[in-house]
Interface confidence: medium
């Protein structure tokens, strides 16, 4: 049969057990939902002073870092289906390509975009958060990359394993070290230049920076001071821009940018590294 | 058997176990030395700055919020052992309360302690925090305080229970609100009031405050400006205690020792319902 | 408070060195993200941006003048120079210095230095 | 390309200026205010914001290519020259709009 032929039938067969089987979706609806609301709660009403600065560089990396911890549990994805997809790849049933491509179109691409869009359309206006259109899908579009780029990252490291709980683990401990050179536990700028380039595997790095660059962009954060005169705020952060470029973010629109071509990198890299390892699994089995 | 016999006999055994089965403890020293030399290397040097400020924020969250999620392992301490629990206390062989004392006293005591000791070795030194002795060892006692009472809290779940990934999803799923209320995601000033009564159920939050409070007092942020005059930005945080205020923190001694004594309250209420869960476990059993 | 100062020759000839100095106060070039740049504005007509400087030394320059413009920085002393060769009549503009942070706009200015260049 | 070159307005009359870039600048555009014998004063910047200071009657909109400044009730203090600066790549200034009084 056809590469198409195969792909329909294996995201059919993937949709129908998702619909099948709705309470872990509708369970994890639930709970996104339920944590944005006390998100939403806690961080109500943002404003424009020294303690804007704070919670909102904090709730971005909250959103950032939930992002990439509750997609470990896309390590179940390969690893549960493993004897399965074993016993019908060598039965002739479809091609690992089919395979690996409807387990992605059917199962990840829609759990891992909801939680996104729900977070976003909750916590955005909720914080009130920059009120512009541009800014609200940059933030959507941000937290599906990050989600993305995690959920590949699990994918990678998974796939061929038979036990879930060692690479979820594996999992953890790298995202522990990612979430520490995101960008708000330590200032990238003063990290020493023998141990600063490990901030470019760091996935909520990027989602982090962008998110920060979407939202800090034009703010001010000195009610009623005049910034233009002789300003005796010299150790003050009054602007968005300030901030920034204190955390070592480049203002340019490549410096928003270049983050989601570097999770998109990400992204085909772990991908590739998962779609090799079900090839490499087939062979040995 | 006395009480004090049946005590030693658990505590001998447990010590035993231990020493015999070594490759957990000192893998488990190993891991702490490593993440203190790693988070060391990171923030080593803290700067007098603006970054002074973030990086030392950053660091002491950090220390706090792995001391609580690294105590959830202390959930496997009874219920690995429920069934021997069981089957010894029917036959006799000691009270309720030796065992549970005799427990705590050559497991969790030991265990918990060590990684306090060695990170505030380690780290202290690298960072460059607070040249004080006193400082040294609140630090160290805070920690150490935060240890036992996550791992208290994770006892009071756990015991009575038959397996151990409940009671660690329902401990994760705690630390990461107790996490959100800490202080450093959000300036607690600035949640709503309704909600704000939240933060008093937080461990992480009593001992960053008590690492804030301690690390922060008596510093300067802003190089070349004489922060003993009257400071003339409203907006520039210059001194410790300009930051400790902006985060909503007594200045005064029982600012910092409140911490301690809300953390000792919470170990000796989350013991208690530990104890009383193994009472009520023996009653059924 | 932030403070900048620019001082230069006044008037010279048409082929001399004109030699520009900033002198601030209130903040660092050594600082994360402080920058300070050159902009003229010739009698009667708009403003021209020149040149950057920033806390690391890197340079920038308006390409249109690239190669005749050297811009360089004394971080101890607190002051910033613009160095324009073989300058001409054109080039009679009041000189400002401006404090800027990264490639953010302009907020802290100088009052301006007048150069004419007149033989 | 900064229109128009000058500008006669009334007191309390509305005033537009308009800045078109050449490409997409982003939105990283900024307005000045200069008066005679001073340094041009920061009003707004990356499109929208207002500088701290700035009255609310000036307001500024935008996105791509396109950029307009307003004045939404010219006061005899607002008599002076504006400015754009677009600040994506380096820095470059519109020509000017010399804003008077009928």
């Known amino acids: 049969t056809s590469f198409c032929h195969q792909l329909r039938w294996v995201s059919k067969r993937s949709f129908k057990n998702l619909l099948g089987n709705p309470q872990a979706s509708i369970a994890q609806i639930i709970v996104t939902v339920v944590l944005g609301l006390v998100i939403g709660a806690i961080y109500f009403g943002l404003k424009n002073d020294s303690t804007g600065i704070q919670n909102r560089a904090g709730v971005l990396f909250f959103l950032t870092t939930n992002q990439c911890f509750s997609s470990v549990s896309a390590v179940e994805l390969f690893v549960v289906e493993k004897k399965l997809f074993i016993h019908e790849y060598i039965s002739g049933y479809y091609r690992v390509s089919s395979y690996f491509l409807g387990k992605l179109l059917s199962d990840l691409l829609p759990m891992r975009m909801l939680p996104s869009i729900i977070f976003t359309c909750i916590v955005y206006f909720m914080l009130g958060l920059k009120p512009k259109a541009d800014a609200f899908f940059v933030m959507m579009f941000t937290l599906m990359m990050v989600a993305y780029s995690a959920s590949s990252m699990a994918l990678a490291i998974a796939a061929g394993q038979s036990v879930v709980s060692v690479a979820t683990l594996l999992m953890t401990i790298c995202f522990v070290f990612m979430m520490i050179f995101s960008g708000l536990l330590v200032n990238l700028t003063t990290i020493a230049s023998w141990l600063s380039w490990l901030q470019y595997f760091s996935i909520p790095r990027y989602g982090f920076t962008a998110l920060q660059h979407n939202e800090f962009l034009g703010q001010n954060f000195c009610p009623g001071l005049n910034a233009t005169g002789n300003n005796p705020c010299n150790y003050a952060t009054c602007t968005g821009e300030e901030y920034l470029v204190k955390q070592g973010i480049d203002l340019s629109p490549w410096g928003l940018w270049k983050n989601h071509v570097a999770l998109a990198c990400m992204i085909v890299i772990f991908l590739t590294i998962a779609y090799l390892k079900l090839l490499f699994l087939k062979k040995y089995s | 058997t006395s009480f004090c016999h049946q005590l030693r006999w658990v505590s001998k055994r447990s010590f035993k176990n231990l020493l015999g089965n070594p490759q957990a403890s000192i893998a488990q020293i190993i891991v702490t030395v490593v993440l203190g030399l790693v988070i060391g290397a990171i923030y080593f040097g803290l700067k007098n700055d603006s970054t002074g400020i973030q990086n030392r924020a950053g660091v002491l969250f950090f220390l706090t919020t792995n001391q609580c999620f690294s105590s959830v392992s202390a959930v496997e301490l009874f219920v690995v052992e429920k069934k021997l629990f069981i089957h010894e206390y029917i036959s006799g062989y000691y009270r309720v309360s030796s065992y549970f004392l005799g427990k705590l006293l050559s497991d969790l005591l030991p265990m918990r302690m060590l990684p306090s000791i060695i990170f505030t070795c380690i780290v202290y030194f690298m960072l460059g925090l607070k040249p004080k002795a006193d400082a040294f060892f609140v630090m160290m006692f805070t920690l150490m305080m935060v240890a036992y009472s996550a791992s208290s809290m994770a006892l009071a779940i756990a015991a009575g229970q038959s397996v151990v990934s409940v009671a660690t999803l329902l401990m994760t799923i705690c630390f990461v609100f107790m996490m959100i209320f800490s202080g450093l995601l959000v300036n607690l000033t600035t949640i709503a009031s309704w909600l704000s009564w939240l933060q008093y159920f937080s461990i992480p939050r009593y001992g960053f405050t008590a690492l804030q409070h301690n690390e922060f007092l008596g510093q300067n942020f802003c190089p070349g400006l004489n922060a003993t005059g009257n400071n003339p930005c409203n907006y520039a945080t210059c001194t410790g205690e300009e930051y400790l205020v902006k985060q909503g923190i007594d200045l005064s001694p029982w600012g910092l020792w409140k911490n301690h004594v809300a953390l000792a309250c919470m170990i000796v209420i989350f013991l208690t319902i530990a104890y009383l869960k193994l009472l009520f476990l023996k009653k059924y059993s | 408070q932030v403070t900048l100062k620019e001082s230069g020759p006044g008037i010279l000839r048409p082929s001399h060195t004109l030699s520009l100095t900033c002198s601030f106060s209130g903040f660092s070039l050594t600082t994360y993200g402080i920058c300070v740049s050159w902009i003229r504005q010739p009698s009667g007509k708009g403003l021209e941006w020149l040149a950057n400087i920033c806390w690391e030394d890197s340079k920038a320059y308006n390409p249109s003048l690239k190669n005749r413009l050297t811009i360089s920085k004394d971080t101890s002393n607190n002051q910033v120079f613009l160095r324009i060769p073989s300058v001409d009549t054109a080039d009679s503009a009041i000189y400002y210095c401006?404090?800027?942070?990264?490639?953010?706009?302009?907020?802290?200015w100088g009052q301006g230095t007048l150069v004419t260049v007149s033989s | 390309t900064q229109s128009p070159p000058s500008l006669s307005a009334s007191l309390g009359d509305k005033v537009t200026i308009t800045c078109q870039a050449s490409q997409n600048i982003n939105k990283y555009v900024a307005w000045y205010q200069q008066k005679p014998g001073k340094a041009p004063r920061l009003l707004i910047r990356y499109t929208s914001t207002l500088e701290s200071g700035t009255p609310s009657r000036f307001s500024g909109s935008g996105s791509w290519r396109d950029y307009s400044f307003s004045i939404s009730n010219v006061e005899s203090e607002d008599i002076a020259d504006y400015y754009c600066l677009q600040y994506v790549n380096l820095w470059t200034f519109g020509g000017g709009t010399k804003l008077e009084l009928k």
């Open positions: 401006a404090r800027v942070f990264n490639n953010y706009p302009f907020p802290y």
